[in-house]
Interface confidence: low
């Protein structure tokens, strides 16, 4: 239903606090470098101008769509050009460009330093001082690094962290209460972070149609009980939700998230037995378990797949007459069978399906052409599962660590143009796969590995279409979404490539590396290694671990010493030239 | 299609006994938690109590604890009240609904304590 104002409908629906964080989210998200107190003061005339229009929806200005609100307070920030360059551009544009010039500028990699967590006394004294203000930089140091973070799954985020301060600050070893479970939620907000960027870049890239057909296969495994009517109501309601909070218009993807939760929970005889737990919980934690919710237990009297979509005589009858719904029921039939099988893989399938049918219906005999449709499917299924085994074999072996080194060499011989510190972020974050997939049950590891996989290389094109460098990355994520995996594992060491030269700097070493973190360690290693395939792309695996084992060995020893600058700097040169002679 | 019917309600006298059946269809009752939800006209919906799919877990509203015990018969797809030492506070249309939601997806059944 239309409203007088949408501004006070929004601020009425979500109440202040929900309100007032989503529109810092949404700041934070257009203009990048802008300071938390910048923010928060545009926040604060936002949420005093959303009261007036409460209390009177006839008032000047109440009537203006949020967009054009939100657009014109961004654009009276002063010094708008000197900041932001070529993004105060947007600013001579009218609604709605103006708000897709706005989006098209969201930078996915900000030149922003990393967020520095501060040390436990300091950070439970300014929370204790300023509860609202603490959680308000969360917000903003979090959407600003992450310009397409789900809003209204950060705000939930934000309540896990204010949760743990409020315990831990009254513990005695505040510390050792915080870490760990502050990391928790940091490992599991950045997976939902890379998560989400992919739905957006599906949007995107694709339309709603590709999202809806993600959104049908995911919520047919989660739901099998549910009727295939039930199942495209949801992803029509999931799609709505995501398209909002992609396209920057985060209270009213908020707001139908919260109709889409309350829905599902009205109605969860015809969805799942599953939900209730879920929906015993406040809006913010139930909507996030809804999300992640445990599969229902399969009907166990489905028919086999074939009946209705191989055998039937009326196949391509049924396909002409509404080619999408055809197509449609074949994914949920064939999800709900499969919730073992990851949405890229299942949607693999169906455009295999539909390429069938549109080759297969224009000719003599269609159910001759089509009969062997599914033992088709076989080698597609194969290829990630035997891609699952492979690399699950091969973390056991090696550890997270291990495992993260061996898919640097592996993706720095694809592509070693890209930049060193984006092929070390791909390969730690793609190594964490293991951690994340390889100990679950053998029935989820595919799902899990896949679909974390897809969303990890969608961040990683990204990055490249920003500059770039290599034609194998470029042809991989020119592709569709669902052929990117595929495509990237395919790919071998780039035989164009003309090896760098060797530079004793990019190895040399000094005894600050001794007091960093034991991550920023790892880092540093990996940067070296990458620059070694780079210099030596047809290293053998046996070339490699001798260098690394080397210097893993220098860096022990030299740390150890007495006099550390003085073995790093006698010892070094010493571990170069031995590097040099290992690769020749 | 989803169907929640219920029965059982009545006039009765403050401190009598009511017992209100909730007939379903239309889905695996056996897999839900159920509830009961009572609402007075001009009011918002109040949960009285709920019972979870099996039937070892129930819960109460404290206004009606020690008074009211929910139950089901998952073979026969029905949710019971029994309401003992009734009180004029308890007049109200009581719905049975899926779940521990306060939504109504049925015609309910009125419930009328005289003093």
């Known amino acids: 239903e239309a409203h007088k104002s949408e501004i006070a409908h929004r601020y009425n629906d979500l109440g202040e606090q929900h309100f007032k964080g989503l529109v810092l989210i949404a700041f934070s998200q257009y203009l990048q470098k802008c300071s938390y107190d910048e923010h928060a003061k545009l926040v604060q005339e936002v949420t005093d101008f959303a009261k007036t229009c409460v209390a009177d929806e006839s008032a000047a200005n109440c009537d203006k769509s949020l967009h054009t609100l939100f657009g014109d307070k961004l654009c009276a920030i002063p010094n708008l050009r000197e900041n932001y360059g070529e993004l105060a551009d947007c600013c001579t544009k009218q609604e709605p460009e103006r708000n897709e010039c706005f989006l098209q500028h969201k930078d996915d990699n900000p030149s922003l330093p990393p967020f520095e967590r501060p040390e436990a006394e300091a950070m439970c004294t300014s929370f204790k001082e300023n509860p609202t203000t603490f959680m308000g930089h969360y917000l903003h140091e979090v959407a600003r690094r992450h310009p397409y973070f789900y809003a209204p799954e950060l705000l939930y985020y934000a309540e896990q962290y204010n949760e743990i301060l409020t315990q831990c600050c009254a513990e005695a070893d505040k510390e050792s209460c915080l870490t760990p479970k502050l990391d928790g939620v940091k490992e599991k907000a950045l997976v939902s972070s890379v998560r989400q960027r992919m739905k957006c870049s599906s949007m995107q890239k694709f339309g709603e149609r590709a999202f809806k057909a993600w959104a049908v296969a995911r919520l047919s495994q989660t739901f099998p009980n549910a009727d295939f009517a039930e199942i495209t109501k949801l992803a029509t309601d999931l799609t709505k939700v995501n398209k909002e909070c992609c396209h920057g218009d985060l209270l009213e993807c908020a707001d139908d998230r919260a109709e889409l939760a309350k829905y599902m929970c009205e109605n969860q005889a015809t969805i799942s037995s599953k939900l209730q737990t879920c929906c015993d919980k406040p809006l913010l934690k139930k909507a996030h378990c809804l999300s992640e919710v445990e599969h229902d237990t399969m009907p166990a009297d489905l028919p086999a797949i074939a009946a209705d979509f191989v055998e039937d005589q009326e196949v391509c009858k049924n396909y002409a007459e509404a080619k999408d719904v055809f197509l449609g029921t074949f994914l949920y039939e064939y999800s709900r069978r499969h919730p073992d099988y990851s949405v890229s893989l299942l949607l693999r399938l169906a455009k295999k399906y539909e390429a069938t049918l549109e080759k297969c219906c224009a000719e003599a005999n269609p159910p001759a052409c089509y009969g062997t449709v599914l033992a088709e499917f076989q080698p597609l299924v194969e290829e990630p599962k035997n891609l699952v085994k492979t690399n699950c074999d091969l973390y056991e072996k090696l550890g997270e660590y291990g495992f993260q080194n061996a898919i640097l060499v592996r993706y720095t011989q694809k592509a070693p143009q890209v930049s060193t510190p984006t092929l070390v972020e791909a390969a730690r974050n793609l190594g964490r796969v293991g951690t994340k997939c390889c100990t679950l049950p053998e029935d989820q590891r595919l799902p899990c590995v896949e679909d974390y996989l897809s969303a990890i290389l969608n961040r990683v094109c990204l990055l490249h279409e920003k500059t770039p460098v290599s034609e194998h990355v470029t042809k991989c994520c020119s592709g569709s979404l669902v052929e990117r995996r595929p495509c990237f594992s395919a790919l071998t060491v780039d035989e164009t490539y003309v090896p760098k030269e060797f530079k004793a700097e990019t190895f040399t070493f000094h005894s600050d590396i001794c007091t960093l973190p034991e991550k920023e360690k790892q880092i540093k290693k990996q940067t070296a290694l990458a620059e070694l395939v780079k210099h030596k792309p047809k290293a053998t695996a046996e070339q490699l671990k001798t260098v690394m084992d080397d210097f893993a060995q220098f860096l022990d020893t030299c740390c150890k010493a007495a006099d550390k600058d003085t073995c790093f700097s006698t010892e070094g040169p010493n571990l170069v030239t031995r590097c040099k002679d290992a690769l020749a | 299609e989803v169907q929640l019917v219920e029965s059982g309600g009545g006039l009765v006298q403050a401190g009598g006994s009511l017992r209100l059946s909730c007939a379903a269809s239309?889905?695996?009752?056996?897999?839900?938690?159920m509830s009961w939800v009572r609402q007075v006209p001009g009011k918002g919906p109040e949960w009285v109590s709920a019972?979870?799919?099996?039937?070892?877990?129930?819960r109460y509203a404290e206004s009606i604890k020690g008074r009211f015990i929910i139950s089901r018969d998952n073979a026969k797809k029905t949710l019971y009240l029994q309401m003992n030492s009734l009180k004029p506070e308890d007049t109200a249309v009581y719905y049975c609904?899926?779940?521990?939601?306060?939504?109504?997806g049925s015609q309910g059944t009125q419930v009328t304590v005289s003093s």
């Open positions: 609904t899926i779940g521990q939601s306060t939504s109504r």
């Open positions: 239309g889905f695996t009752f056996g897999s839900f938690g």
């Open positions: 019972i979870d799919s099996g039937g070892t877990d129930t």
